[in-house]
């Protein structure tokens, strides 16, 4: 799973780098991008890099950054207001029931059947059955022939909230 | 290594006052918010107050406003509570605690407190 | 104010089995997709100690046995396999309101 930065990864100098406030928060909430402070008096902005709130709030902190692992890809840097948006590397894929890593995608369909959809970064190469036409999941078994598929051009990021 | 050393409990009669103290060593005290957890004899964890890294804003539970305060010198690396108009149901181990975004990822050994005439 | 109940108040468990506690809060800890709860063990004798926070992710150096999951109200906090240096109480917290409060506590026992 994509690590969350934690302070103790921030060079002290990060960690202390200066606050900036705003205004009195609004009905005891603070906007995107900033939190509130222990007393309720202040909105403290998030620290670009470091960490991000993305709607009003009232909590006394801004969310972690994700830090996309090894295997995967940064699509768009965290900002204030927004989390790092993370993507498996090319030939890889994410599946909604086991989020926490990227997988190898399957080099080829299994005999009897046809790629009927690529691998992309949040689905492995599609195979149905030449005859029926009925998908096929789960581990290819060793076979003689395999149809060769190309990985998948990235399309929609898959974002991994901290 | 983080260290948290609490120092200042003991045994007051209600309406007395007392001073804690916690000595931070091992990280950069004036970068992080710190809080006061309070267990009591039943074993459970109540927050009492919290202050952020350089001390200008803090938060007292409803338990204690008013009678509690949290303070830090962060030159001296060192968080204080000062209590007043102690009454029995203060009576607890206080724990200083540092506080890590959502978590409190270090706790010091804790300091008893018995407030009993 | 957010209440955390746990349960069970106490788990009698053999070593080398799986540990199940729960948490279940009075009202939602998510904020954007984040679940704001943090577990922590407390041995005899001994301060808190974290485990978990963010609901799953694992504390530095806390051991691979520990492993937290849920979203909404609901959360559990898991060990397997238990071992002997496990018998503590545990306690989960959240920090999505203030206060943040803390759950009454499991006791972790060894059948």
């Known amino acids: 799973e994509s690590a969350l930065i934690t302070q103790q990864d921030l060079a002290p100098q990060q960690r202390a780098a200066p606050q900036q406030k705003r205004s009195s928060p609004s009905e005891g909430l603070c906007p995107p991008g900033h939190h509130i402070s222990e007393d309720g008096r202040d909105c403290i902005s998030c620290k670009y890099g470091q960490d991000y709130s993305t709607h009003w709030n009232d909590l006394l902190f801004c969310l972690r950054c994700t830090r996309c692992d090894s295997g995967e890809v940064e699509l768009s840097p965290c900002t204030t207001t927004r989390n790092t948006v993370c993507q498996c590397e090319e030939g890889t894929f994410r599946e909604e029931d086991s989020p926490e890593m990227c997988r190898k995608c399957r080099t080829g369909c299994p005999r009897g059947m046809v790629k009927v959809g690529d691998c992309t970064p949040w689905s492995d190469i599609e195979c149905v059955h030449k005859e029926s036409g009925t998908k096929h999941s789960g581990e290819v078994p060793a076979v003689e022939e395999t149809v060769t598929s190309s990985p998948g051009t990235p399309a929609s990021p898959c974002s991994l909230s901290g | 290594e983080v260290q948290l050393v609490e120092s200042g409990g003991g045994l007051v009669q209600p309406g007395g006052s007392l001073k804690l103290s916690c000595a931070a060593s091992g990280f950069t005290f004036s970068t992080y918010g710190m809080s006061w957890v309070r267990q009591t004899p039943d074993k459970r964890l109540e927050l009492v107050a919290l202050i952020n890294s350089q001390g200008g804003s803090t938060y007292n539970s409803d338990s204690v406003k008013g009678r509690f305060t949290i303070s830090r010198d962060n030159a001296r690396n060192t968080l204080y509570l000062q209590m007043s108009s102690l009454k029995s149901e203060d009576t607890a181990m206080y724990y200083c605690a540092r506080r890590d975004y959502e978590s409190l990822d270090s706790w010091g050994q804790g300091t008893s407190v018995t407030v009993s005439s | 104010d957010i209440v955390l109940t746990q349960s069970p108040a106490s788990l009698p468990v053999s070593l080398g089995q799986r540990a199940t506690i729960s948490c279940r809060a009075s009202e939602s800890v998510e904020y954007s997709g984040t679940s704001l709860i943090q577990w922590y063990r407390q041995k005899p004798g001994q301060p808190p100690k974290l485990l978990i926070y963010?609901?799953?992710n694992v504390d530095s150096e806390v051991p691979a046995r520990f492993s937290g999951s849920g979203s909404g109200t609901d959360f559990s906090l898991y060990i397997h396999p238990v071992e002997e240096d496990d018998i503590a109480m545990y306690f989960c917290q959240q920090s999505r309101k203030v206060p943040w409060t803390f759950g009454g506590g499991t006791k972790l026992e060894i059948k």
């Open positions: 963010a609901a799953s």
